[in-house]
Amino acid sequence: AMDLILINSLPLVSDAETSLTCIASGWRPHEPITIGRDFEALMNQHQDPLEVTQDVTREWAKKVVWKREKASKINGAYFCEGRVRGEAIRIRTMKMRQQASFLPATLTMTVDKGDNVNISFKKVLIKEEDAVIYKNGSFIHSVPRHEVPDILEVHLPHAQPQDAGVYSARYIGGNLFTSAFTRLIVRRCEAQKWGPECNHLCTACMNNGVCHEDTGECICPPGFMGRTCEKACELHTFGRTCKERCSGQEGCKSYVFCLPDPYGCSCATGWKGLQCNEACHPGFYGPDCKLRCSCNNGEMCDRFQGCLCSPGWQGLQCEREGIPRMTPKIVDLPDHIEVNSGKFNPICKASGWPLPTNEEMTLVKPDGTVLHPKDFNHTDHFSVAIFTIHRILPPDSGVWVCSVNTVAGMVEKPFNISVKVLPKPLNAPNVIDTGHNFAVINISSEPYFGDGPIKSKKLLYKPVNHYEAWQHIQVTNEIVTLNYLEPRTEYELCVQLVRRGEGGEGHPGPVRRFTTASIGLPPPRGLNLLPKSQTTLNLTWQPIFPSSEDDFYVEVERRSVQKSDQQNIKVPGNLTSVLLNNLHPREQYVVRARVNTKAQGEWSEDLTAWTLSDILPPQPENIKISNITHSSAVISWTILDGYSISSITIRYKVQGKNEDQHVDVKIKNATITQYQLKGLEPETAYQVDIFAENNIGSSNPAFSHELVTLPESQAPADLGGGKMLL
């Protein structure tokens, strides 16, 4: 609602500073507030443009300040105008010289159509001149010099709307500078009536409130509020919701308040006089001290608020029993709220007595739109109104107002809403790698459109052409692996960013499509890898019988352990072996195989093998003879890997016997590293030699080993570890 207030301080201009302040209280005008000279009311006033400035103490207020040296240019009529949603509201006021020859009884006077009216001016300077009275700058009446009374009056026995206007009085030899002004406001309707045809009945406007002839609403005096102006504001406050405050040391002293017609101008409650600098006499209160306290039960009369009722009593005269009314208070509403665009459910919470009802709580958007609660509940102490805005957008940012209007009074609390744009990635995620059941994704969450900071990120995915809901995973890193995907399936991927606050999920970003690989066949069975020559290895496997009609082949990967040498070979699916050639002698190779169709199969376990040696094997090392008894002994050794050693020969003979009397023991399993010689003679010395054999030949022993068996009675020692052939 529009609440425009013009403060005229002071209307009687002397040599002191004087000002006009226009306040848009509790609403945000669509166009700037304007302050100007009211030439309609007074044509021949000063023409200088006004220096209008922003009132720094209030958000929506304009001010004109005249320094004392400008006193001569101030006399005249002024207006303040504000607009919201096509509706304009104009407030008028006047300023005149304190040294004028006459002074008006009041700055404005509001009467009903048909009233018997006397407009009066008090003579303050006596001159031997005729007195003249003007209306809106045009002469209407004169009084001969010898008949000029102390109170100069214009009598209107049946006031009509056309009688309204600015009346001025001066001596004939004077001018605008010495004129006194008063403005007569005539309500278009008779007393207690309103409406286009003036046949509606007004609500009672208490405390000198005025019934608006067009709407039937009460315009409340400064210091009172509510539908019927029954509720007194807190000390030194004013405005439709009493949220404006007089900053003077003595509150609203010396402030003349002008409100929209038909109210006109008056002092704030508790003050009277043309300059509003006189306190009310005891027993009187209200604007211009026009209201008389008639408090029941000897209650106190306060010049600002009227009767101060004891607990359990209420009403203007404390005439009604009941819990005293308490002005509503808005609670738990922060000054600033950050909101994500989309659905928004603001809450207004208020206390007071009686508790505000659903109908009494509203929310006003920055553009002036009034919202009503979608949901409402109350406890013993609070009413809670929940509003719904289905789609709040950044242009809705600004000052919103929670408004509560009950019989106990009205309160408004402005709060700032900042509507944020939900974030959305600009780019689709990138697919780095895929398999038959996984995909590695770079989510590409930046750059993004909209507002941060980003609280969390979701990767959304679903198979294309499936009527499935999107699945999602929360992600923290830019690179993420999606597991448990279906093979040979086209997927859609996108990223959703979430900013802080309720409803912070942004729209998903651009979509990327990718297809998982088909599921792989199992590796060949019965894989065997054996050396064939110094440069070849032979890999064999069992025949493959695929389950589908798809063509298939065997892929064999071989790599050298010693060198960075790798080769992949494709083998037709009907074969069961492959010769791996062009290898290096005496080199270890790792081989694995898989069966591929259009999709790659699963790799087998690694197989390792050495190519045959191109040199004689080295002699076995670490040869030890142990566990000697009267008839046996254990021989152990180690051999070096990689020489294609196929067997080990142990040769022994009794010392001193001929060479041809030796015994050869050939161990064909090269993995055996121990052997027990048996059937030896007691207390006999033996010469023992050991050789390694490979595809090239035998190793050359550098020296022989001696073994002496024990006498028959002696016990043997424990056997050593290692593989042993008995």
Epitope: Q192, G195, T203, A204, D214, T228, G315, V407
Partner: antibody
Framework: QVQLVESGGGVVQPGRSLRLSCAAS????????MHWVRQAPGKGLEWVAV????????YYADSVKGRFTISRDNSKNTLYLQMNSLRAEDTAVYYC??????????WGQGTLITVSS | DIQMTQSPDSLAVSLGERATINCKSS????????????LAWYQQKLGQPPQLLIY???TRESGVPDRFSGSGSGADFTLTISSLQAEDVAVYYC?????????FGQGTKLEIK
């Protein structure tokens, strides 16, 4: 909370009189103009009468002028409708309503008057 | 007296669909000096008193859902329910308060199709 409760309805013979009452609570009764509005069974709404907040001004619909009298007792927070010379066409549910700025913002639940011989 | 005429007398609309009720006054209820239309809309559910929905032809009363909207000027007015809900089944009345006697339209019964 604003409450309006009508009473005094019933069956009455044509030509007889009846007085309806409307008890108000939850607001300053003496500040508001009050109305009576009626609704014949199965028909639409018809405004009957209005009284100013202090009882000094009253208006009536032509159909009831001279027969019905609206009054109020602000000390008892009660609105009245004195209905004389009742006719069959006066049969209706009678609502009392609080007006602000031209509209009926609060209504009672209504009381049924049946005028029948 | 100003006569008020509503159309249609009854209306059946599917849930979620738009419902439109018209109201015509025998003379303009627009007051030129403040550019306001002195027209209100009420909803009356079965067995209940009427409830104020809209005043000044287009201002929603506190607590009225925003699916209800009023429009028009002069002598032709419309009440629109943008998306009909089950609880909107009722009789709807327009009323002029340009002058006394206050007069209502004959009502429009709104049902679900």
């Amino acid at each position: 909370q604003v409450q309006l409760v009508e009473s005094g309805g019933g069956v009455v013979q044509p030509g007889r009189s009846l007085r309806l009452s409307c008890a108000a609570s939850g607001f300053t009764f003496s500040s508001y103009a009050m109305h009576w509005v009626r609704q014949a069974p199965g028909k639409g709404l018809e405004w009957v009468a209005v009284i100013s907040y202090d009882g000094s001004n009253k208006y009536y619909a032509d159909s009831v002028k001279g027969r019905f009298t609206i009054s109020r007792d602000n000390s008892k927070n009660t609105l009245y409708l004195q209905m004389n010379s009742l006719r069959a066409e006066d049969t209706a549910v009678y609502y009392c309503a609080r007006q602000y700025s031209g509209v009926f913002e609060y209504w009672g639940q209504g009381t049924l008057i049946t005028v029948s011989s | 007296d100003i006569q008020m005429t509503q159309s249609p007398d009854s209306l059946a609309v599917s849930l979620g669909e738009r419902a439109t009720i018209n109201c015509k006054s025998s003379q303009s209820v627009l007051y030129r000096s403040n550019n306001r239309n002195y027209l209100a809309w009420y909803q009356q559910k079965l067995g209940q008193p009427p409830q104020l929905l809209i005043y000044w032809a287009s201002t929603r009363e506190s607590g009225v859902p925003d699916r209800f909207s009023g429009s028009g000027s002069g002598a032709d007015f419309t009440l629109t329910i943008s998306s009909l809900q089950a609880e909107d089944v009722a009789v709807y009345y327009c009323q002029q308060y340009f002058s006394i006697p206050y007069t209502f339209g004959q009502g429009t019964k709104l049902e679900i199709k």
